[in-house]
């Protein structure tokens, strides 16, 4: 009876999400393997988040708009492990917008989800950020490693979206 009611709840939750995401990929987790965590197909999952690499070229504002249409934000990177996971799926000759900007050019960087900007957990390339006119951040491959660079926000780039996993 308990299992039946849990299944019914799951099905109704799935139907609720189906109007936003035609397909979800779910895995069982939790200590009793009773919880399902899901990401929209074909997003990838890492820890408690889902990630989508957008290969369409857009300005930073449009990229954030595009992520929000999908119920996400431009990616906020909190750890080196998270960055290493994300970069496995990136092309080394491309650049991708992050959810990090300096709107006034005062070198006050801020994440789109209001996560505090911690200078100790940043992965800027050597010598970056280097211009107060470049107010948006990308991740790209340079000098044999992935890192961040400040760029002009209006020049189109690819982007990375991030959202919380859906639990059912």
């Amino acid at each position: 009876n308990f299992m039946y009611s849990k299944t019914v709840k799951r099905l109704s939750k799935l139907q609720e999400y189906q109007q936003y995401y035609p397909s979800l990929t779910c895995v069982m987790e939790g200590k009793d393997m009773e919880d399902w965590s899901c990401c929209p197909t074909p997003w990838t999952s890492f820890q408690s988040s889902c990630y989508f690499i957008s290969t369409v070229m857009q300005s930073w504002t449009k990229s954030q708009n595009n992520c929000s249409v999908m119920g996400a934000d431009l990616v906020v990177i909190n750890t080196k492990e998270e960055q290493d996971f994300i970069t496995q799926n990136l092309k080394i000759n491309s650049a991708y917008f992050l959810g990090l900007s300096d709107p006034k050019g005062w070198r006050h960087w801020q994440w789109v989800d209001q996560t505090p900007y911690n200078k100790n957990v940043t992965f800027w390339h050597s010598g970056e950020p280097n211009s107060p006119d470049e107010r948006c951040a990308i991740i790209n491959f340079r000098s044999e490693e992935w890192g961040w660079n400040d760029v002009h926000c209006h020049v189109p780039q690819k982007s990375i979206c991030k959202m919380k996993k859906i639990y059912i």
Epitope: M57, S59, T61, K62, V69, A95, D133, H152, V155
Partner: antibody, heavy 120, light 107 residues
Framework: DVQLQESGPGLVKPSQSLSLTCSVT?????????WNWIRQFPGNKLECMGY???????YYNPSLKNRISITRDTSKNQFFLSLNSVTTEDTATYFC?????????????WGQGTLVTVSA | DIQMTQSPASLSASVGETVTITCRAS??????LAWYQQKQGKSPQLLVY???TLADGVPSRFSGSGSETQYSLKINSLQPEDFGNYFC?????????FGGGTKLEIK
């Protein structure tokens, strides 16, 4: 005020390469923005061909496959279009255009255009 | 690529009349639409960006409207200098494609 000026041969033979120069005055092409080539066919249809960004990175319209290259000479504040293996279908007026104005919402600065005819 | 369908292809009107040109996108372009005017032998001139904002120096008789996939350019009280070709262009995702154009002629 920024000004763009196209130059290059007006007549190119089929199968040869088309090469055009855009000279920019009033703004450094390495400071910001992205620098486009757009063409207009005889029936007035417009096509974005590709661009070179202020940082030197490129985008090319997939419809032009591997025929297109856009490069620059920062010392002369110029950028260039090279289109290989041209056919009569490449006959058009070619414009150089600055991109990224109005938070990338419209192209405000255009060259006056140069007509290129592909003919034997 | 997003396709832009512009109509009508041509239009005859008299000075003082009001005309409307429409543009339909094959997908939602989130108001990232520009309108241009082009005179014979000249380069296109930006009139409107972000669907409804007039570019610098554009007279207030021009106005843009629309959302999602449907957009229009309205010209009130046509002036002799308004005749020429008009193009729409989306600015949502690269490549930014143009409509086929509307030729506005004097009746």
């Amino acid at each position: 005020d920024v000004q763009l000026q196209e130059s290059g041969p007006g007549l190119v033979k089929p199968s040869q390469s088309l090469s055009l120069t855009c000279s920019v005055t009033g703004y450094s092409i390495t400071s910001a923005y992205y620098w486009n080539w757009i063409r207009q066919f005889p029936g007035n249809k417009l096509e974005c061909m590709g661009y070179i960004s202020y940082d030197g990175s490129n985008y090319y319209n997939p419809s032009l496959k591997n025929r297109i290259s856009i490069t620059r000479d920062t010392s002369k504040n110029q950028f260039f279009l090279s289109l290989n293996s041209v056919t009569t279908e490449d006959t058009a007026t070619y414009f150089c255009v600055r991109g990224g104005d109005y938070d990338d919402g419209g192209f405000a600065y255009w060259g006056q255009g140069t007509l290129v005819t592909v003919s034997a | 690529d997003i396709q832009m369908t512009q109509s009508p292809a041509s239009l005859s009107a008299s000075v003082g009349e009001t005309v409307t040109i429409t543009c339909r996108a094959s997908g939602n372009i989130h108001n990232y639409l520009a309108w241009y005017q082009q005179k014979q032998g000249k380069s296109p001139q930006l009139l409107v960006y972000n669907a409804k904002t007039l570019a610098d120096g554009v007279p207030s008789r021009f106005s843009g409207s629309g959302s999602e996939t449907q957009y229009s350019l309205k010209i009130n009280s046509l002036q002799p200098e308004d005749f020429g070709n008009y193009f729409c262009q989306h600015f949502w995702i690269i490549p930014y494609t143009f409509g086929g154009g509307t030729k506005l002629e004097i009746k």
